[in-house]
Every structure is written in C-alpha cells, then in structure tokens.
Interface confidence: medium
C-alpha cells in the first residue's frame, strides 16, 4: 500500500512510536512496565499499569484485590481480569440470599416444590425456585407440561413437600455455614474454582512481544499484548480464555495468544449442557444413583435441584442411552452418581428439621 509508506516512514527514527502493519499506522510505544489498553496506542494515556496477580485496576486507577471464591458454597463466575474483579456466585443448586460486592455473603439451597405445585421458574444462582399450583388436568408429578411423559422417559415425580418462597419462610432453604461440606458437594462434585489460575498450558502472550521489550521498528510481527489468560479475538480485542477450574472439567487445548482455552468434561463424565469452548454442566457416566435424582434442566445458568425419589421408586440405570447414541449426547435428565457415603448426608430442603436414619435415608424429625 504505497499510500501508507509516508506514515510508516514517520515512525522510523522516533523511538516512542512503532509502525503496526495490521492497522497500518504509527502507534505509541508504551514505556517499561506499562501495557496498551488498545491495539494501537496513540498517546501515553492509552497505556496502563499492570497490577499484581489477583489484583485489578479499579475506576480510580488503583490496584484492588479481586474477591476470592474460596468458600465451599461459591464458584467463580468470571475470572480476575486486569480491569475487573473476579466475580463469585453461589454454586449450582444454590441461590444468593445476601449479596455482596462481586460475590454472595450467604447462599441457600434451592427449594423443592411441594406436592400439588410445579416449578414455574427453576432456581438460578441469584434466585430461588419459583413454584405455582399445578393447573387442572396436569399431573402434579410434572415439572412442566412438556415433561409430562411416560415414566420410561426418565422423569421422576417430585417428592417431599417443601415451602418455596424465601420471602415468607427462611426455614425452607438451607444455608451453607462455616465451610461445612455438605453431601450435595460430594454428590455433584461441583466444588469451588481455585483462587489461583490454572497452571496448565502456557502464558497467553509471549513476554517477548511485550511493549516492555519493544518490537523491531516497522515489524508487523508485533501483535497486541493481552493479559495472562486472555487471547486476541477476531475483532482484535483481548478476550478472557474460558477457565477449566471447575472440578468436573479438564483442559482440552490451552489458552493461546489467538485462541481460547477449551475445556471438556473430565474422564467418566459427559457434557449435559454445552457452552462456548467448554461445558456448562457435566454429569457422571454411567449414571446410576441409589438415593438421589435430578430434575431436568435445559438452561445452562439454571441450577439442578436435588430431590429424593418417592419411596418405592428407583431411577433407571442404563450404561448407554436407550436410543443408542454416544455418551456425549446422553440426556441430562438422569440421576447423578452418589456413593453410599455421600448419600448419608444428602441435604433435603424441608420445612421440618431433617434427621438421618441409620440406613442413611433422611427422615422428617417431628420435633
């Protein structure tokens, strides 16, 4: 592009600028210790300082500690980035009753709809399950009309009447206090994301390309420096690589300078709800449970509600789906794997106190 040559020439001999062939213009070279906030900085104000690991640059240009999701009832929603805090939310199966900045101060288990009620809105990390009366002609066993099929479809009738509205009855939900490890964690294996980033893979950007080690004058090989664990997307923006820090995920491909990390379910698990470059929900495979079943959930951000099956029922245990598809396509409507120890302490949200019998089955404690 001959018309661009004059611009390129003006960069030569000017140590504070370099020519970026990608954008075909002169760019300001950020000084030592400073990093560009855009692909082609034009002035010193387009450069920023780097905060320490687990710190982010707030609106006042101060390095502020990212919140940690180290409590048992929290998981990482978004990672700690250069300009924003890590965000924590209640782990699947729980909702936030007392919010905190970028986190939640108190998480409660989702309520289970009582007999004669059906789920109107499934619980999320922010909201409890909302129930509504079953409409006439629809079996109370159906969570929604589209799920009212023959029992062979895997739908299990709801059990154990429990109050629903957190506004009227705080006793209907069970908080996790003092880091107590509840068996729901053992059953679902959905533990917290670690505070420290994954050490798997390689740095998302090559320190040799950092503006602290200026690129050769006029070099087109000097690409934008993204933060650790970020990649340069097609639009030239630094985008966070997905995190495989959930217990049920493993890294398939690492975070590279121009592509995201990809995650897949760990061995022995299959993806029930896919997500970009990752899996929103992994379930064990084969999927057999002795005492616990899950309600089907379609939306990735909506959480599974754990329930006890009605007495005398037992979910099917099929090593392979009935339609003969590969495990990856297995429906998430089957139950999660629970070992005999975990089933002894499975929380059953209920308005009455719960005791555990010697058999490990929850029993209602009348007082």
């Amino acid at each position: 592009f001959p018309q661009d040559r004059p611009f390129e020439d003006t960069c030569h001999g000017n140590p504070s600028h370099y020519y970026d062939k990608a954008v075909r213009r002169c760019c300001y070279r950020c000084p030592m210790g400073l990093f560009p906030t855009q692909q082609c900085p034009q002035r010193p104000t387009d450069c920023r300082k780097q905060c320490e690991p687990d710190y982010y640059l707030d609106e006042a240009d101060r390095c502020t500690a990212c919140v940690t999701c180290s409590r048992d009832d929290l998981v990482e929603k978004t990672p700690c980035a250069w300009n924003s805090s890590r965000v924590c939310e209640c782990r699947p199966g729980m909702f936030c009753s007392t919010s905190a900045v970028n986190s939640c101060a108190r998480c409660f288990f989702h309520s289970v709809c009582p007999a004669g009620m059906i789920v109107k809105f499934p619980g999320t990390a922010q909201k409890n399950t909302v129930c509504e009366p079953a409409s006439p002609g629809v079996s109370p066993a159906c969570a929604s009309p589209e799920n009212c099929k023959e029992p062979s479809s895997g739908t299990i009738p709801q059990a154990k009447p429990t109050p629903v509205s957190p506004a009227t009855s705080s006793a209907s939900t069970m908080p996790v206090r003092g880091g107590t490890r509840l068996a729901q964690e053992a059953a679902s294996k959905l533990t917290r994301a670690p505070d420290s980033p994954s050490s798997v893979g390689r740095p998302s950007s090559d320190p040799g390309l950092s503006p602290t080690q200026p690129c050769p004058e006029g070099s087109g090989d000097c690409r934008k420096q993204c933060e650790p664990d970020y990649y340069l997307d097609e639009a030239g923006r630094c985008t966070a690589c997905v995190s495989c820090s959930r217990d049920d995920l493993v890294e398939k491909t690492p975070c590279a300078w121009n592509s995201s990390r990809t995650c897949e379910c760990r061995p022995g698990m299959i993806c029930a709800t896919s997500a970009t470059n990752s899996c929103a929900r992994c379930v064990p495979y084969p999927i057999c449970a002795a005492e616990t079943v899950t309600k089907p959930q379609d939306m990735a951000e909506k959480d599974t509600t754990f329930e006890a099956p009605p007495l005398g029922t037992q979910p099917d245990c099929n090593p392979t789906p009935e339609n003969g598809e590969a495990p990856a396509s297995t429906s998430p409507t089957q139950s999660l794997l629970v070992d005999s120890q975990a089933s002894k302490t499975l929380p059953i949200p209920t308005s009455a106190p719960v005791a555990l019998s010697s058999t490990g089955k929850p029993v209602l404690d009348a007082g």
Partner: antibody, heavy 121, light 111 residues
Amino acid sequence: EVQLQQSGAELVKPGASVKLSCTASGFNIKDTYMHWVKQRPEQGLEWIGRIDPANGDTIYDPNFQGKATITAYTSSNTAYLQLSSLTSEDTAVYYCARGYYGSSYWYFDVWGAGTTVTVSS
Amino acid sequence: DIVLTQSPASLAVSLGQRATISCRASESVEYYGTGLMQWYQQKPGQPPKLLIYSASNVESGVPARFTGSGSGTDFSLNIHPVEEDDIAMYFCQQSRKVPWTFGGGTKLEIK
C-alpha cells in the same frame, strides 16, 4: 544510569517516628511501582509494601499496616517510608526497590543501598 | 501468606563444583504457566541483587553459571561452576500472592 539513592542512617528513640527517603535517577518513578523491604540484622527479608507513585495507590503486608506509611512525590522522583511507634523490633536495614512488572513477571530489579534504622533509648 | 522454605540453610562447595539451593513454597506460585519465583544474591553490606526471575529467566548481566528451574511449589537455583565471587547469601522470593514473601536464605561458602 538507573539508581535509587536512600537517605542516611537513623538513630531514634523508642516510641518515636522516622521518615526514610528513596530518590530515583535514570527513570521516572510514576512509570513503576516503588517497594520497601525490611531486613533485620543477620535475618531474612520482609516485604513491607509498595506504592504506585502516579496516584498514591498503596498495598501493604498486613503485618506492617499501621506501622508503615509509604508515600511518594513524583515532582522530586522520591518515595518515602514512614515508620511510627518505633520499638527495638524495628531496628533493621530498610531497602527501597523498583518493581518491574510484566505479563508474566513481577520482581525487584533495582535496589537502593539501604538505610539503617537503630531504635535505642 | 505463602511461606517459602529454603534448604539448606548453609552450603559449602568446592570451587568449580555445583551448588544447588532449593526453595519450597507452601502453595503453588504458578501464574498461567509461569512460576513467579525469583532468586537474589546478597553480599555483606550490600543490597540484594536479582539473579533469576520467573523461575528460570536469567537477569541481564548475570553470568550464565546461574540457572533457575522448577514449577508449582518446588524451585531450585544452580550455580555451576562455583567461583570465589559467589560467596553470599541467596534468597528466593515469590510474587504470586500479596504479601510478597522471601525465603529464609541460604549461605554459600567455599570449602
């Protein structure tokens, strides 16, 4: 040449305060972070904290919160460490150091010669 | 806080031989695939001097006799061949988590 020039030795009484200085040459302190490190006689190194001279943003080791105050003046290219309510435990050499920060590295690349503080009645 | 444990506390090596100093962290200091561990040399009456940063990168001006290795929680500094000028205290330091912490130090002596 990049250098950090620290103020001279101090002999102070218990309960008093002292303010140490660290003047940079060869670079602008507002483009970096300035750290302070403590070293007691015949002992290891302890990180006290750091300041972003561009805006006064500080981070301290909780063990030094209340004991140490780090400030900086970009006009004089100088960082300061003030130590209050001094006791014999504060007798040490105090170093200032430049923090070098990158995409995958954070370290002290330039150190001052140190200032000896002796607390004695 | 991340605690760094250096071993040995003192080390006597013959000239021309190899000296190995270890540093173990109480938790991982990895950050996106890089171990945020540094090594410093300190001679009596002098400030510490940076030798190695990010586990294995040799600071400019430092002799190639100094090498760093390790990942996760275990790191080491190797000096080979050891020279008279290497008599000093050596400290490891992590910058993975605030507060940044140092190891207790290893005193290198010549046999």
